[in-house]
């Protein structure tokens, strides 16, 4: 298995390699096979990354930042492979690497441009602040700066506040949207153009449900086929908002097919789950069950939020006793 990196061929002996933060990559270089092979990799034509000659590595003058992070494909050198295996790339490793190869009859140079991207899985959060409701799309660590777009009922909206914090090696970004009083569906897309990776968050508000005390309620949660791929690992969480904070009722992990239920009156239908329907039942309702119920289906590529508002009213019997 090759580490995650992909090559883009550009003219003049120069290739672009794109890697992910903390992952391993290969900087490619090939040459016409020959004897007395000498291989030198240098960064920005100044710092020694890796040296090989007289049939072995010579790393005495290797720049300390590359210590224990580089190696060649030693069994492949005789076949003209001078590629460098590079461990745990960081954003500081971005730049131009030059491979110098000398054989008994020739010298070649290959330039490789390394670009490093970061895309820690974003999240879509639903928050209440006083009387206002907000959707927040956020990504804890991303590089380069991503493109964030919002849609309301599938129509792009221009309002796009972005709260950005830059650290040494990446950005942390929050994009809040005030959705107070709206029944629309919302979609937020965060795109990392370098890694060609897109994440989508989708929020849907269902019609309010009015129930009587001691009844049960069925709340639907079915993923939209556009985003959902059952083959991909995902997590489903049902939570209830009480006085501004969410408490988790239950969650399901697709990888282990485990269901963890924190509320005894909560039930999930196993057969429906197998059909990717995560609707739930809450039995024996009481007045304190009134509130907002949130179903969150999340994977590396999307978050689907479905919100239900439930009003539990006193039953006639309870009312007459008062």
């Amino acid at each position: 298995i090759f580490p995650l990196a992909f090559f883009i061929y550009v003219p003049m002996n120069e290739q672009i390699v794109i890697g992910r933060l903390d992952e391993d990559i290969i900087l490619p270089s090939s040459f016409e096979r020959g004897s007395e092979v000498v291989i030198h990799w240098k960064y920005q034509d100044s710092y020694k990354v890796h040296s090989y000659y007289k049939g072995s590595d010579h790393l005495e003058s290797q720049d300390p930042r590359y210590a224990n992070r580089t190696s060649l494909f030693y069994n492949e050198i005789q076949n003209g492979n001078a590629s460098l295996f590079f461990r745990r790339v960081s954003l500081l490793d971005e730049g131009i690497y030059t491979c110098y190869v000398g054989t008994a009859i020739q010298v070649i140079t290959n330039k490789v441009v390394l670009k490093v991207g970061v895309f820690l899985t974003p999240v879509m959060k639903y928050e209440k602040r006083n009387t206002n409701s907000f959707l927040i799309c956020s990504v804890l660590s991303v590089y380069p700066r991503p493109i964030i777009t919002w849609k309301m009922d599938n129509t792009p909206i221009s309002e796009n506040n972005m709260e950005e914090t830059g650290s040494l090696d990446s950005f942390s970004i929050n994009s809040p949207l005030n959705i107070t009083g709206s029944n629309s569906s919302y979609e937020c897309t965060i795109e990392n153009s370098l890694l060609k990776q897109t994440w989508t968050g989708r929020w849907t508000m269902k019609d309010g449900l009015h129930k009587m005390q001691s009844e049960h309620v069925s709340l639907s949660c079915q993923p939209v086929n556009d985003y959902f791929s059952p083959n991909q690992d995902f997590k489903v969480t049902w939570s209830r908002m009480k006085s501004g904070t969410f408490s988790v009722l239950a969650y399901y992990l697709s990888s282990s097919q485990n269901t963890i239920i924190n509320e005894s009156r909560f039930s999930w239908n196993k057969e429906l789950i197998n059909q990717s329907d995560f609707s739930m039942n809450l039995m024996d309702l009481n007045l304190s069950d009134s509130g907002e119920y949130l179903c969150n289906i999340s994977s590396d590529e999307y978050t689907l939020l479905t919100i239900h508002t439930v009003h539990v009213e006193p039953s006639q019997e309870t009312a007459s006793h008062n």
Epitope: E36, K54, Y100, G102, A104, I105, V107, T109
Partner: antibody, heavy 121, light 106 residues
């Protein structure tokens, strides 16, 4: 101090053979290639052959095939070039030079002072 | 074989002038070109490698440029001690030298 010290001038008869030496000092002898270069009366430079002291392997210029034989003595850090079947065409100054591949120069960064050879009867 | 051609055998210049010595390769050699200076009665001395990198101790009045097939060694503010022969050399495949350009001071 890095030095390549060559033997002095030689006057030899046509058809003879001659061995000239190049004593290297001030660096790790097996880490650098020794290249032998000819400079004729017209001041043109031509590489003849090179030797990798670590492997003992040589690579020659086809124009000088069978003209030179290169050897090294690692313990005395000396490179030798034997010139065979000398003719007046071989009258020239012969240089040994260090070819640096260890620091990515890939160039001849140090040269001996040259050995002048005159082939004449 | 790759042929290196220095079309000017001799170039005349005055002290303080700027002079450009030209070298052409018969095929693409990338930047695998070195320049050497040889003063009368001395061995060649490395000035430039990889077409444009100055060797240790070489004054910055010497500048190398070019890639592919066309290379230039430029000497600015020429001094009398710069009277010498200048050779280009390719090391892309084996080694070949140009015929040399003799710099004369008027």
């Amino acid at each position: 101090e890095i030095q390549l010290q060559q033997t002095g001038p030689e006057l030899v008869k046509p058809g003879a053979s001659l061995r000239i030496s190049c004593k290297a000092s001030g660096y790790s002898f097996t880490d650098y290639i020794i290249v032998w270069v000819k400079q004729n009366q017209g001041k043109n430079l031509d590489w003849i052959e090179k030797i990798n002291p670590y492997y003992g392997t040589t690579t020659y210029n086809l124009r000088f095939e069978d003209k030179a034989t290169l050897t090294v003595n690692k313990s005395s850090t000396t490179a030798y070039m034997q010139l065979n079947s000398l003719t007046s065409e071989d009258s020239a100054v012969y240089y040994c030079a260090r070819w640096d591949y260890v620091s990515t120069l890939f160039a001849m960064d140090y040269w001996g002072q040259g050995t002048s050879i005159t082939v004449s009867s | 074989d790759i042929v290196m051609t220095q079309s000017h055998k001799v170039m005349s210049t005055s002290v303080g002038d700027r002079v450009s010595i030209i070298c052409k390769a018969s095929q693409d050699v990338g930047t695998a070109v070195a320049w050497y200076q040889q003063k009368p009665g001395q061995s060649p001395k490395l000035l430039i490698y990889w077409a444009s990198t100055r060797h240790t101790g070489v004054p910055d009045r010497f500048t190398g440029s070019g890639s592919g097939t066309d290379f230039i060694l430029t000497i600015t503010n020429v001094q009398s001690e710069n009277l010498a022969n200048y050779f280009c050399q390719q090391y892309k495949r084996y080694y070949t030298f140009g015929g040399g350009t003799k710099l004369e001071i008027k």
